[in-house]
């Protein structure tokens, strides 16, 4: 065979979002009969010549970008797509709230606000149960994110995280869950574009906002890093979203 071997896949099980001290397995998958696998942590000298890395307890130092490749004979494969392994629960949870409220009729508007008391400049918003893993994460280190063809399918449970662009793989614990209830007819499930533009967003202190318009028109909104994944973690007890009010006694 001439040319490089096709790239393997690299995945984190059960999720690439890993609460501190919880286990995770990184698995490199190539074609049958591979002679040697190499799994490496980028920007470090760490690597291992095995297809599976089991991390029994997630640590801050293990968060970062990973990739793998394999060797057959004297040929090396192309490297896998990079996997971003994120440690969560490193910082205190942000607060997620809905304005004007978590119940909205189809065709109405709602704004989800993720707020932190710290200086974090990045936010991630998750809708529980979305099946697709997120891709191309670099594009989502943005303060803004468009939502296209938003529908009543946006009913569900949301959580947000906050983190700093200086340490993008160390995230807060998830916010308490926010249940968004949409009344009215259900239409086509919404899709998030994989390569969103990056308009400049204006922030009031450390707040990320997502405005969801429940209409059938294309509606571009400003939001935080918003990705579709379903992290199986419970860093904080479930409960109503914590509201932040104006400072006062």
């Amino acid at each position: 065979q001439s040319g490089p071997l096709p790239k393997p896949s690299l995945q984190a099980l059960p999720s690439s979002l890993v609460p501190l001290e919880k286990p995770v397995t990184l698995r490199c998958q190539g074609p049958p009969g591979v002679d040697l696998y190499r799994l490496e942590k980028l920007s470090s000298s760490r690597y291992q010549d095995q297809a599976v890395l089991f991390i029994p307890a997630m640590k801050r130092s293990l968060a970062g970008r990973y990739r793998c490749s394999y060797q057959n004979g004297s040929l090396w494969s192309l490297p896998s797509d990079q996997l971003e392994l994120v440690a969560t629960g490193v910082f205190a949870k942000p607060s997620l709230s809905a304005q004007p409220g978590p119940a909205v009729s189809s065709g109405g508007d709602v704004t989800l606000q993720c707020q932190t008391r710290y200086g974090f400049d990045q936010f991630a918003l998750y809708k529980e149960g979305d099946p697709a893993p997120y891709k191309n994460p670099e594009r989502w280190y943005r303060a803004s994110f468009p939502i296209i063809t938003v529908t009543a399918a946006h009913s569900g449970t949301y959580r947000c995280y906050s983190f700093s662009s200086r340490d993008p793989y160390l995230w807060s614990a998830p916010s308490d869950p926010l249940e968004l209830v949409v009344t009215g007819t259900s239409v086509t499930p919404s899709r998030l574009p994989t390569e969103p533009p990056s308009p400049v967003a204006e922030f009031s202190e450390a707040t990320a906002e997502l405005t969801v318009s429940f209409t059938n028109e294309v509606f571009t909104t400003e939001t935080s890093r918003s990705i579709t994944a379903s992290p199986k973690e419970s860093d904080s007890p479930a409960g109503p979203a914590r509201q932040y009010y104006t400072k006062g006694n």
């Epitope: 910082f91 205190a92 949870k93 707020q115 008391r117 710290y118 200086g119 974090f120 400049d121 303060a143 700093s164 662009s165 200086r166 614990a173 308490d176 967003a201 922030f203 009031s204 202190e205 450390a206 904080s236 007890p237 409960g239 914590r242 932040y244 009010y245 104006t246 400072k247 006062g248 006694n249």
Partner: antibody
Framework: QVQLQQPGAELVKPGASVKLSCKAS????????MQWVKERPGQGLEWIGE????????NYNQKFKGKATLTVDTSSSTACMQLSSLTSEDSAVYYC????????????WGQGTTLTVSS | DIVMTQSPSSLAMSVGQKVTMSCKSS????????????LAWYQQKPGQSPKLLVY???TRESGVPDRFIGSGSGTDFTLTISSVQAEDLADYFC?????????FGAGTKLELK
């Protein structure tokens, strides 16, 4: 007005544990995080951790994990910090302080409890 | 952890003089989204607990006299007392509120001549 009341002093033997209290009044206890800070002469101020009284969620300085345990009793608007396996290094003034609502600053402080660890 | 370094460790001033003290952080405290610097100043008078003076580097806490002026950005910050009063004799601490663990400077002791 906002007040955070702490006992003036505690004397404890090495190896023992102690529970320091902080009674809040003058504001809605569950709306503000409670912070704890250690002060030793010549060592300045060290942040121990914080607790959200609305759901007892805690966030610790790694240095004090295993040493300090933060709890709250919302019925009496009291925050507590238990310190375990005490040594002379734990002798210090311990402050509780209310966390400002939109920033991680400490806008009201208790008078502090002087903890002395001595046999 | 972010290291906060204050200077000088002490200074002696006369009433009415202008006082300037410095605080440097080992990392930038500027949030690029909102252009706020997450730096606070506290005053601790002898035998008392600390009192919040300034947050976001330059926002005075309510009730704090306007002779206390916070300034700076990124990693270099200054607290200025435009005309020092006898009651300003105290230790002054800076604190970063950018990220946990929250960290404080070692303090500047203001003494009166």
């Amino acid at each position: 007005q906002v007040q955070l009341q702490q006992p003036g002093a505690e004397l404890v033997k090495p190896g023992a544990s102690v529970k320091l209290s902080c009674k809040a009044s003058g504001y809605t206890f569950t709306s503000y995080w409670m912070q704890w800070v250690k002060e030793r002469p010549g060592q300045g101020l060290e942040w121990i951790g914080e607790i959200d009284p609305s759901d007892s969620y805690t966030n610790y300085n790694q240095k004090f994990k295993g040493k300090a345990t933060l709890t709250v009793d919302t019925s009496s608007s009291t925050a507590c910090m238990q310190l375990s396996s005490l040594t002379s290094e734990d002798s210090a003034v311990y402050y509780c302080a209310r966390g400002a609502i939109t920033t991680a600053t400490l806008d009201y402080w208790g008078q502090g409890t002087t903890l002395t660890v001595s046999s | 952890d972010i290291v906060m370094t204050q200077s000088p460790s002490s200074l002696a001033m006369s009433v009415g003089q202008k006082v300037t003290m410095s605080c440097k952080s080992s990392q930038s405290l500027l949030n690029s989204n909102n252009q706020k610097n997450y730096l606070a100043w506290y005053q601790q008078k002898p035998g008392q607990s600390p009192k919040l003076l300034v947050y976001f580097a330059s926002t005075r806490e309510s009730g704090v006299p306007d002779r206390f002026i916070g300034s700076g950005s990124g990693t270099d910050f200054t607290l200025t007392i435009s005309s020092v009063q006898a009651e300003d004799l105290a230790d002054y601490f800076c604190q970063q509120h950018y990220i946990t663990p929250l960290t404080f400077g070692a303090g500047t002791k203001l003494e009166l001549k």
